[in-house]
Interface confidence: medium
Amino acid sequence: DTEIKVNPPQDFEIVDPGYLGYLYLQWQPPLSLDHFKECTVEYELKYRNIGSETWKTIITKNLHYKDGFDLNKGIEAKIHTLLPWQCTNGSEVQSSWAETTYWISPQGIPETKVQDMDCVYYNWQYLLCSWKPGIGVLLDTNYNLFYWYEGLDHALQCVDYIKADGQNIGCRFPYLEASDYKDFYICVNGSSENKPIRSSYFTFQLQNIVKPLPPVYLTFTRESSCEIKLKWSIPLGPIPARCFDYEIEIREDDTTLVTATVENETYTLKTTNETRQLCFVVRSKVNIYCSDDGIWSEWSDKQCWEGEDLSKKTLLR
């Protein structure tokens, strides 16, 4: 009874299509598959950034796989062939591993790469990234930003740089169609007459870096002798009401400070008849139903009521 063996896939490689971190892992079928013509061969693929403790594992029947990586580090991957038990009249058979690696040869010392990269997607409409020049780089150094996300044919360069002292220190992005809920890849590289500049790679999803506009049209309404309803409106833009959380700061008579987090555009406040002044501000953030993270908006303009009895039915109109 001869032992069934299968070869590893051939020509296993990692291909960089120029998408700033979105790489293709591809291979060819193993040699000598003739014995298993009636059998669907599967492949177990494992890959990771070098330095990561865990491997990502994929089982596929295809001859390719695509995923995003951190190009600041190297990538290692390994793959072997799997013959399911249905093909071998017994247990699953695995080939030996085929292995490959990929890295971008780094130019320049790490200190030359951009520092403090910060990207904010304002109101889910306008992406702005800013950075500081590398440590000790001269004014002749200039940085260039490139970006890609699935849906673009190729990586694009920033066309609207923010400058300081003649150096690019940020980028205002154009309208980014269908760009959220997918990985957004950025590379900032540089050039200098004096020394090579280290490239930096960044990956994030736009919905997780949204900073909304603050709420607008804050109003008060007396609901009962001891309750006041605070109301506001969502700011204009593409963010639907269901995506907002709000934080309120309420100050009564310059002393009591109440803070609360709510999901709706209203908040009911218990008050006493002695309250002479009431002020509140609100800020907004994209909630967990629409993103994994977010940035609080600026505080709204303060809305106050003072000098008259708060028991009036409607305080602002």
């Epitope: 409409q125 607008v216 049209y217 204009l236 303009d301």
Partner: antibody, heavy 119, light 111 residues
Framework: QVQLVQSGAEVKKPGASVKVSCKAS????????MNWVRQATGQGLEWMGR????????DYNQNFKDRVTITRNTSISTAYMELSSLRSEDTAVYYC????????????WGQGTLVTVSS | EIVMTQSPATLSVSPGERATLSCRAS??????????MNWYQQKPGQAPRLLIY???RQGSGIPARFSGSGSGTEFTLTISSLQSEDFAVYYC?????????FGGGTKLEIK
């Protein structure tokens, strides 16, 4: 509460100038655009221009051909509109009106100032 | 400049009925996915009052019977069930481009 209080009615001769003031209270003056709109008796509304009190940035309606000047004094939360080379067709009620931003319309209006131009 | 045209000039409706007012812009007033279109109500001797901003957002303290719709060049203000205090002149206004321009107004009168 938000209030925009305008200066009183004026009677002017043709060729003269008029300056209307608008004192804001109940909100942070520099956080909102201030617009000027006029309305001749029985007629519609005509936008004259706006100022951003925060930085003094101004947009004018070119139909007034450099006759209108909008200014502000943030220290006293007051906006001003001056119209020069007055003619009889400038007889109208002039309103100041606060706007949160370009897309938000104007949500609070002054009580209006009647300017009468007559010889 | 963008020319705003309102129709009809006068609309006669009975209390409790629905009123539909139209406004047409000479070119699109949409930008950034937002319609820069606002509606105001004006009663005799009073300043205008903001009803609707950005085509469909209700102004602060505006009753729910007032609603706005439309995009591009065609816009509608609907008052679902007319109350006696709703009889007034209504103006549309675009704020996409300077100069901001108003429609000529629609006078809503009791039938």
């Amino acid at each position: 509460q938000v209030q925009l209080v305008q200066s009183g009615a004026e009677v002017k001769k043709p060729g003269a100038s008029v300056k209307v003031s608008c004192k804001a209270s109940g909100y942070t003056f520099s956080n909102y655009l201030m617009n000027w709109v006029r309305q001749a008796t029985g007629q519609g509304l005509e936008w004259m221009g706006r100022i951003d009190p925060y930085d003094g940035d101004i947009d004018y309606n070119q139909n007034f051909k450099d006759r209108v000047t909008i200014t502000r004094n943030t220290s006293i939360s007051t906006a001003y509109m001056e119209l020069s080379s007055l003619r009889s067709e400038d007889t109208a009620v002039y309103y100041c009106a606060r706007g949160y931003g370009t897309a938000y319309g104007v949500d609070y209006w002054g009580q209006g100032t009647l300017v009468t131009v007559s010889s | 400049e963008i020319v705003m045209t309102q129709s009809p000039a006068t609309l006669s409706v009975s209390p409790g009925e629905r009123a539909t007012l139209s406004c047409r812009a000479s070119e699109s007033v949409d930008n950034y996915g937002i319609s820069f279109m606002n509606w105001y109500q004006q009663k005799p001797g009073q300043a205008p009052r903001l009803l609707i901003y950005a085509a469909s957002r209700q102004g602060s303290g505006i009753p729910a019977r007032f609603s706005g719709s439309g995009s591009g060049t065609e816009f509608t203000l609907t008052i679902s069930s007319l109350q006696s205090e709703d009889f007034a002149v209504y103006y549309c206004q675009q704020s996409k481009e300077v100069p901001w321009t108003f429609g000529g107004g629609t006078k809503l009168e009791i039938k």
